[in-house]
């Protein structure tokens, strides 16, 4: 299973609750042999995904995988919604699965959901 | 290889909790899904939910909502199934299962907990 | 919820035999990375049930060659080229697509 292939760390339909107001580090393990390559992040609208030019990000490198991270200063309630990292290496484009963002606005919640009910009910989270 | 240890039997009685353990090894949690199935007596599979022990997440089930809850220790790579207000319809071989988060690699099932509810 | 429909619900083949399971799904099983997540599993007598086959046809490690999977759309079938005695057992299709995952109500595969 190990390889000199570029592998993206995403788990297939991964989920997070979020707060908007709150920040947060969606992050996107790379790992690669030689040469790091170029990652960026999208935000998916229906089937297209919408390349995120002018956002923060940064690296973060360990031992055995590096991350390209998003960065939410601090999380707004319209970044709900799925994103996908693509890396650019040897003219191949590969593509995470996509991870979804369920943004709670709390201002608008009369009261903070549980952390049980942001789990089981997303489709409270965004009012 | 990857493995998973669930705790033993149990009988309850109508209306009370259980909580079933299940170990894994071979495999950093994190980096799967883990999910509980049931089969009654004689019957079918039925999914109860799941959890990303990466980051607590867990579905269920609708008919489980509220009624299950599935949690995770990533310090001891072990899962939780908890069912409240048991009745006699919940008797069953209770299973979890884990796999592989990113590609697939694995499906492994735990050798089953028998859950009896009976007054 | 998704629903998937086994056919038959049970059948009897002789030793070296070959034996075909069908499943249907009342939704398209591709996620949005373009794949079908659905798999089979094998349930012999007294034990968990153990995958054998995930993405419709790739073979999981140690499974023997006689099992394949095929299928796309909502149709999906599983054969055994030539049944074993060890074959007995009830095989479930399942979604991996959609929450709530389901499974197929379970095919008897029995030794005539």
């Known amino acids: 299973k190990e390889s000199c292939d570029v592998q993206l760390y995403i788990k297939r339909q991964s989920e997070h609750s979020i707060l908007a107001g709150d920040p947060f580090e969606l992050e996107c393990p790379v790992k690669y042999c030689a040469n790091r390559p170029h990652v960026t992040w999208c935000k998916l609208n229906g089937t297209t995904c919408v390349k995120l030019e002018d956002r923060q990000t940064s690296w973060k490198e360990e031992k055995n995988i590096s991350f390209f991270i998003l960065h939410f200063e601090p999380v707004l309630p319209n970044d709900n919604g799925s994103y996908r990292c693509s890396a650019n290496f040897q003219s191949n484009l590969i593509e995470s699965h996509s991870t979804t963002l369920y943004v709670t606005d709390v201002k608008s919640a009369s009261e903070r959901p549980s952390k049980d009910e942001m789990a089981s009910r997303p489709w409270l989270l965004y009012r | 290889q990857v493995q998973l240890v669930q705790s033993g039997a149990e009988v309850k009685k109508p209306g009370s909790s259980v909580k079933v353990s299940c170990k894994a090894s071979?495999?950093?949690?994190?980096?799967?899904?883990m999910y509980w199935v049931r089969q009654a007596p004689g019957q079918g599979l039925e999914w109860i939910g799941r959890?990303?022990?990466?980051?607590?997440?867990?579905r269920y089930a609708q008919k489980f909502q509220g009624r299950a809850t599935v949690t995770a220790d990533k310090s001891t790579s072990t899962a939780y199934l908890e069912l409240s207000s048991l009745r006699s319809e919940d008797t069953a071989v209770y299973y979890c299962?884990?796999?592989?988060?990113?590609?697939?690699?694995?499906?492994?099932w735990g050798q089953g907990t028998t859950v009896t509810v009976s007054s | 919820d998704i629903v998937m429909t086994q056919s038959p619900d049970s059948l009897a083949v002789s030793l070296g035999e070959r034996a075909t399971i069908n499943c249907k799904s009342s939704?398209?099983?591709?996620?949005?990375?373009?794949?079908?997540?659905l798999n089979w599993l094998q349930q012999k007598p007294g034990q968990s049930p153990k995958r054998l086959i995930y993405?419709?046809?790739k073979l999981d490690s140690g499974v023997p060659d006689r099992f394949s999977g095929s299928g796309s759309g909502t149709d999906f079938t599983l054969t055994i080229s030539s049944v074993q005695a060890e074959d007995v057992a009830v095989y479930y299709c399942?979604?991996?697509?959609?929450?709530?995952?389901?499974f197929g109500q379970g095919t008897k595969l029995e030794i005539k």
């Open positions: 299962a884990v796999n592989d988060g990113y590609f697939e690699y694995f499906d492994v």
């Open positions: 399942w979604q991996d697509t959609h929450f709530p995952r389901t």
């Open positions: 071979g495999v950093n949690i994190k980096d799967t899904y």
């Open positions: 939704q398209s099983l591709l996620d949005s990375d373009g794949k079908p997540y």
């Open positions: 993405l419709v046809s």
């Open positions: 959890i990303d022990p990466a980051n607590g997440y867990a």
